[in-house]
Interface confidence: low
């Protein structure tokens, strides 16, 4: 039943034409290019995919022509090597140019950029927006996908796509309405922060394939999806995990159309089997292509068969246990992890993957003694402490959240993570202990059952974020090691991080915690994301210093931003008031 | 192969303090879960304290926390308990236990450790 097997083409760039359409087809050549050359301008990038367009147009009418049997890395990497300024703008990348495929798309691959050096995507008003979308609304629409995928190097292409048809079905609507702003705003803060958490989510998978290679992968496909679809036997999810894993493999390395393509055979092979999949399907079967794909990636989990027997059995008192393991290792340990994940919703994927991992060592060790059966029989013992760590970790930092609400809880992770690693830059520290203390208003109110897949998975999305930032320029070991060595023990291995004892602390500069009247006009975030940035260097200077001091020095440091923005002459205000409050906190630290 | 060689024990009164190491050779010992049991006369192997493999999460039995504490000094691949307010019933042969495979938490059943050193006697009296 293997969906992705294929006649071979005459010409992929026809085939991948004539299956996606025309307008799915450019939007794709243009994401891809985009998230290749991030810092080219839009104009080049559509010129670009209009040569490559009009090309493929040639191949789907007569598929021997010249260079149509080419690769399409080929094809497109070609194109690519035609920019003139590669060298001036992006350097050593222009050095893949002098490579042969596959080596050059890899070396494109590499120069990746998680964090590139682009301006901040500023929303001009509504009216201007409506404007250039009643223009010219193809460019406009072509826009989005080029700031996004250019932003967001890894975004999931054809998922992309979906949040460019709510996109254009936004201005659509709204453009309209007697109160556009109104209709609108709400509209494109939800597709931002919707798109921030599927370029996250995304980054983490293509990390595990990368970094810990396919098997990392599929081990985190077989518990997710055994927990979403319970009912459905092991057969059916190993077949669904292998043509998962194939859709990321493609996307994740770049192969934009392949991926796209067998993403929509995937959701079609889907549908017509959800009968042996999940009962939970059928709504989102019946939407469009894009709506459909995006609806299974995100649909609840299934019930529970009933009466589902010990796992005990199978994997403890049998006496084929060694036996069914040597004969295929993982297979049984992906049987194990499938009939574990289905009965523990209510566990994170990362948890159930450290439970089959202390399985596998246990059998590994065991298999190989003289009483395999007597070495093994406590091994579910073992996983008492590693459910019970996430357990308590989650209950004290809900407990912590509800305390203090989102904006302190973020203030105390802040806190937290500088202590632990303050060699990180101060803006990926904001970042990351920004978006760690958003677990607490996404999961701590929900029930204990879905807590912890909640928390603990949002976390894993979370820390990636950090250990890709950190990687582009890596600075601290500590987060080296627990980036690298064990995908599904970072948390831990971040949780288990004390104080650094060996940063020397920073030098003070009065100039970190000079503030000017500008404070006043941003929004209620950006001022937030002034103090917090304030916050990380003060423990920076001072990573002594006790909850105490620092809460004193922040509360004085708010009243003083309250007070210059109510006065008359705010920048003489903030000047004057700001030396006093450096003095004063000076002081209050012993700096 | 791992070899273990424990060191440090002896006799001491009640309330008194004793440091036990553990030297380990054919492995670095940040790479592996290990841990310290104990074996009083007549008795089978209890598990008192582990540290896992990879990340510096530590593990102890209730009858000795805030007591004990197990620690690792990865440039001399070294593995410590340092044993706090003793009392008669901690005394026994004290044995550090290695797992293979860096799995994150130590266990507390000593069949799971393959590799053992040949322990140290600690003798708690007055």
């Known amino acids: 039943r293997g969906v992705f097997r294929r006649d071979a083409h005459k010409s992929e760039v026809a085939h991948r034409f004539k299956d996606l359409g025309e307008e799915n087809f450019k939007a794709l050549v243009l994401i891809a290019f985009a998230q290749y050359l991030q810092q080219c301008p839009f104009e080049d990038h559509v010129k670009l995919v209009n040569e490559v367009t009009e090309f493929a147009k040639t191949c789907v009418a007569d598929e021997s022509a010249e260079n149509c049997d080419k690769s399409l890395h080929t094809l497109f990497g070609d194109k690519l090597c035609t920019v003139a300024t590669l060298r001036e703008t992006y350097g050593e990348m222009a050095d893949c140019c002098a490579k042969q495929e596959p080596e050059r798309n890899e070396c494109f691959l590499q120069h990746k950029d998680d964090n590139p050096n682009l301006p901040r995507l500023v929303r001009p008003e509504v009216d201007v927006m409506c404007t250039a979308f009643h223009d010219n609304e193809e460019t406009f629409l072509k826009k989005y996908l080029y700031e996004i995928a250019r932003r967001h190097p890894y975004f999931y292409a054809p998922e992309l796509l979906f949040f460019a048809k709510r996109y254009k079905a936004a201005f659509t609507e709204c453009c309209q309405a007697a109160d556009k702003a109104a209709c609108l705003l709400p509209k494109l803060d939800e597709l931002r922060d919707e798109g921030k958490a599927s370029s996250a989510k995304q980054r983490l998978k293509c990390a595990s394939l990368q970094k810990f290679g396919e098997r990392a992968f599929k081990a985190w496909a077989v518990a997710r999806l055994s927990q979403r679809f319970p009912k459905a036997e092991f057969a059916e999810v190993s077949k669904l995990v292998t043509d998962l894993t194939k859709v990321h493999t493609e996307c994740c390395h770049g192969d934009l159309l392949e991926c796209a393509d067998d993403r929509a055979d995937l959701a079609k092979y889907i549908c017509e089997n959800q009968d042996s999949i999940s009962s939970k399907l059928k709504e989102c079967c019946e939407k469009p292509l894009l709506e459909k794909s995006h609806c299974i990636a995100e649909v609840e989990n299934d019930e529970m068969p009933a009466d589902l027997p010990s796992l005990a059995a199978d994997f403890v008192e049998s006496k084929d246990v060694c036996k069914n393991y040597a004969e295929a290792k993982d297979v049984f340990l992906g049987m194990f992890l499938y009939e574990y994940a289905r009965r523990h919703p209510d566990y994170s994927v990362v948890l159930l993957l450290r439970l089959a991992k202390t399985y596998e060592t246990t059998l590994e060790k065991c298999c190989a003694a003289a009483d395999p059966h007597e070495c093994y029989a406590k091994v579910f013992d073992e996983f008492k402490p590693l459910v019970e760590e996430p357990q308590n970790l989650i209950k004290q930092n809900c407990e912590l959240f509800e305390q203090l609400g989102e904006y302190k809880f973020q203030n105390a992770l802040l806190v937290r993570y500088t202590k632990k690693v303050p060699q990180v830059s101060t803006p990926t520290l904001v970042e990351v202990s920004r978006n760690l203390g958003k677990v607490g208003s996404k999961c701590c109110k929900h029930p204990e059952a879905k807590r912890m897949p909640c928390a603990e998975d949002y976390l894993s999305v979370v820390l990636n974020q950090l250990c890709v930032l950190h990687e582009k320029t890596p600075v601290s070991d500590r987060v080296t090691k627990c980036c690298t060595e064990s995908l599904v023990n970072r948390r831990p291995c971040f949780s288990a991080l004390e104080v650094d004892e060996t940063y020397v602390p920073k030098e003070f500069n009065a100039e970190t915690f000079t503030f000017h009247a500008d404070i006043c006009t941003l929004s209620e975030k950006e001022r937030q994301i002034k103090k917090q940035t304030a916050l990380v260097e003060l423990v920076k200077h001072k990573p002594k210093a006790t909850k105490e001091q620092l809460k004193a020095v922040m509360d004085d440091f708010a009243a003083f931003v309250e007070k210059c923005c109510k006065a008359d002459d705010k920048e003489t205000c903030f000047a004057e008031e700001g030396k006093k409050l450096v003095a004063a906190s000076q002081a209050a630290l012993g700096l | 192969e791992v070899q273990l060689l424990e060191s440090g024990g002896g006799l001491v009164q009640p309330g008194g303090s004793l440091r036990l190491s553990c030297a380990a050779s054919?492995?670095?010992?940040?790479?592996?879960?290990v841990a310290w049991f104990r074996q009083a006369p007549g008795k089978g192997r209890e598990f008192v304290a582990g540290?896992?493999?990879?990340?510096?999460?530590?593990y102890y039995a209730d009858s000795v926390k805030g007591r004990f504490t197990i620690s690792r000094d990865n440039s001399k691949n070294t593995l410590y308990l340092q044993m706090n307010s003793l009392r008669p019933e901690d005394t026994a042969v004290y044995y550090c236990?290695?797992?293979?495979?860096?799995?994150?938490?130590?266990?507390?059943?000593?069949?799971?450790?393959?590799?053992w050193g040949q322990g140290t006697l600690v003798t708690v009296s007055s």
């Open positions: 540290i896992g493999g990879g990340v510096d999460i530590t």
């Open positions: 054919g492995r670095y010992i940040d790479e592996t879960a």
């Open positions: 236990g290695t797992r293979p495979g860096r799995p994150l938490i130590t266990s507390k059943v000593a069949d799971l450790y393959p590799y």
